[in-house]
């Protein structure tokens, strides 16, 4: 015959008001002889909650037949739970006595303790854009949850990261707790795609974390390069100029060209692509009307992108009869 | 091998207490309780109350109850029986014992005869 | 409590016989009973728990029946190691009680 122990294998159970809590209770042998009951708090002030002999326990179930001969579950359910069941409750083992049982052995205790889970985390990022290489911060923030342990990742593209500082509130004790966290991430050029995510587990989740997640598209500005080409057959008249915006994010973009400092006004060609990593590549064809008695063109491509100071690039076109090489050189 | 090994006899006068020890080795002191069980001269067996090292947790046969107290020192594996205002029909042989199950006595202490004489 | 009343309280058998002790609870005590045998100026011995388990080293010549309120302990063949006093103890309830003994010697 194994000696008696009395098995609460939960320290903690977490339950939400209004639901059933299960308390686990087994006993490993059948002697001593007499009842096992249940107990909430310890010491002469603690509270009877179930008595399988005696008393009225409208709340309390058992999960198995006690009366059965070879028992040795105990475990009971407490419906409709209020913020006033909480506390830690004991499975009691009393010996069968005459005048009266005498206590045995006592289980561990399980602590019950009201559960909340805590809000989808959302990640908020900077509110101004920032280029490569620089660093930016991401706030998440969760509410609303007990108790107060719990677990905070960030994560970019799969990739944990370590560079972040997190709080939980209040320090004391609360019916509910907030955390926030703040990660500094550096900006990669090819960031566009990427995306920054908190995880949140916590124990009311059941292994299951909270994720939010942020685009880094929000924050970053990839500014452009810009090429200025002429091209090598010329048309009649005309010579067609290219300017090319590599590689920018945003979209948004104002590109206009300028004859010797004079801005054309007429309409140009122009196709935006879309390249792998997100940023865009956008292509501007400019027609020049050249004559033989003209004298040399200077064309000038200006981008302004997404509200950033102007950019240029210059061509100097040389205008013979017979079209000499082209050269150019770029204005900040 | 389970040992309990109790202190030696004693002599002591009507009105006195007197304190019995029992010290338990080669097993898991916590796991088990221990019984008192008394044997006056010539008569049978009669059981006096019971403790938990664990749990510090006692019961007492009401013929003792009062006068019985039963205490623990998990330090040195050792249980304690003493019993006060001592009277000539407490002269017995006291033994401790090893509970099994919290039920029966699988290991016994050899007694200490506590002699009760004026 | 519960009242154990051993019989007979003195029982005379030859060596190599069979002897039967008899216990008798005053009240139910399921097949919670245990049997002890005490030799002069030594401890009692646990033999049988749960009315008819042996203890470990116990001999199959000791064997145990019985349920509810009445008990047998049966000794097949005895030796002259086996003449002493044997006590029932029932631990259905407390306070644990035990019979006043049933003293065996040699016819």
């Known amino acids: 015959e194994e000696e008696l122990q009395m098995i609460q294998p939960e320290k903690l159970l977490l339950v939400t008001v209004g639901k059933t809590a299960t308390l686990h209770c087994t006993v490993t042998s059948l002697l001593p002889v007499g009842p096992v009951l249940w107990f909430r708090g310890v010491g002469p002030g603690r509270e009877l909650i179930y008595n399988q002999k005696e008393g009225h326990f409208p709340r309390v179930t058992t999960v198995s037949d006690l009366t059965k001969r070879n028992n040795m579950d105990f475990s009971i359910r407490i419906s409709s739970i209020t913020p006033a069941d909480v506390g830690t409750y004991y499975c009691v083992k009393f010996r069968k006595g005459s005048p009266e049982n005498v206590e045995f052995k006592s289980g561990p205790g399980t602590e019950m303790a009201l559960g909340a889970k805590p809000s989808a985390p959302v990640v908020l990022g900077p509110a101004a854009r920032t280029t490569p290489e620089h660093t930016v911060s991401f706030t998440c923030e969760s509410h609303g949850f007990s108790p107060r342990d719990i677990t905070l990742k960030w994560f970019k593209n799969g990739n944990e990261l370590s560079d972040f500082q997190t709080n939980v509130d209040p320090t004391g004790q609360s019916v509910a707790y907030s955390i926030r966290s703040t990660a500094r991430v550096v900006l990669d050029p090819w960031d566009v795609r990427s995306q920054v995510i908190c995880e949140v587990a916590h124990v009311t989740l059941q292994g299951d974390p909270l994720r939010g997640t942020a685009n880094l598209s929000e924050a970053i500005r990839v500014p452009p390069t810009l090429e200025v080409t002429q091209q090598p057959m010329r048309v009649g008249n005309q010579v067609n100029v290219t300017c090319q915006v590599r590689k920018f994010y945003p979209q948004s973009l104002q590109l206009t060209w300028s004859e010797n400092g004079n801005v054309c006004q007429r309409e140009t060609a122009s196709t935006l692509t879309e390249n792998k990593d997100g940023t865009y590549n956008w292509t501007s064809w400019f027609l020049v009307n050249i004559s033989d008695q003209r004298d040399d063109v200077v064309l000038t491509c200006q981008v302004k992108h997404d509200g950033q100071l102007a950019v240029s690039k210059r061509l100097a076109l040389e205008v013979t009869v017979h079209q000499k090489d082209q050269s150019s050189d770029a204005t900040p | 091998q389970v040992q309990l090994v109790q202190s030696g006899a004693e002599v002591k006068k009507p009105g006195a207490s007197v304190k019995v020890s029992c010290k338990a080795s080669?097993?898991?002191?916590?796991?088990?309780?221990f019984s008192w069980v008394r044997q006056a001269p010539g008569q049978g067996l009669e059981w006096m109350g019971w403790m938990s090292p664990s749990s510090g947790n006692t019961g007492y046969a009401q013929k003792f109850q009062g006068r019985v107290t039963m205490t623990r020192d998990t330090s040195t594996s050792t249980v304690y029986m003493e019993l006060s205002s001592l009277r000539s029909e407490d002269t017995a042989v006291y033994y401790c014992a090893r509970e099994r199950s919290g039920s029966y006595f699988d290991y016994w202490g050899q007694g200490t005869l506590v002699t009760v004489s004026s | 409590e519960i009242v154990m009343t051993q019989s007979p309280a003195t029982l005379s058998v030859s060596p190599g016989e069979r002897a039967t002790l008899s216990c008798r609870a005053s009240q139910s005590v399921s097949s919670y009973l245990a049997w002890y045998q005490q030799k002069p100026g030594q401890a009692p011995r646990l033999l049988i728990y749960g009315t008819s388990t042996r203890a470990t080293g116990i001999p199959a010549r000791f064997s145990g029946s019985g349920s509810g309120t009445e008990f047998t302990l049966t000794i097949s063949s005895l030796q002259s190691e086996d003449f002493a006093v044997y006590y029932c103890q029932q631990y259905g309830s407390l306070p644990f009680t035990f019979g006043q003994g049933t003293r065996l010697e040699i016819k």
């Open positions: 080669g097993g898991t002191f916590s796991n088990y309780g």
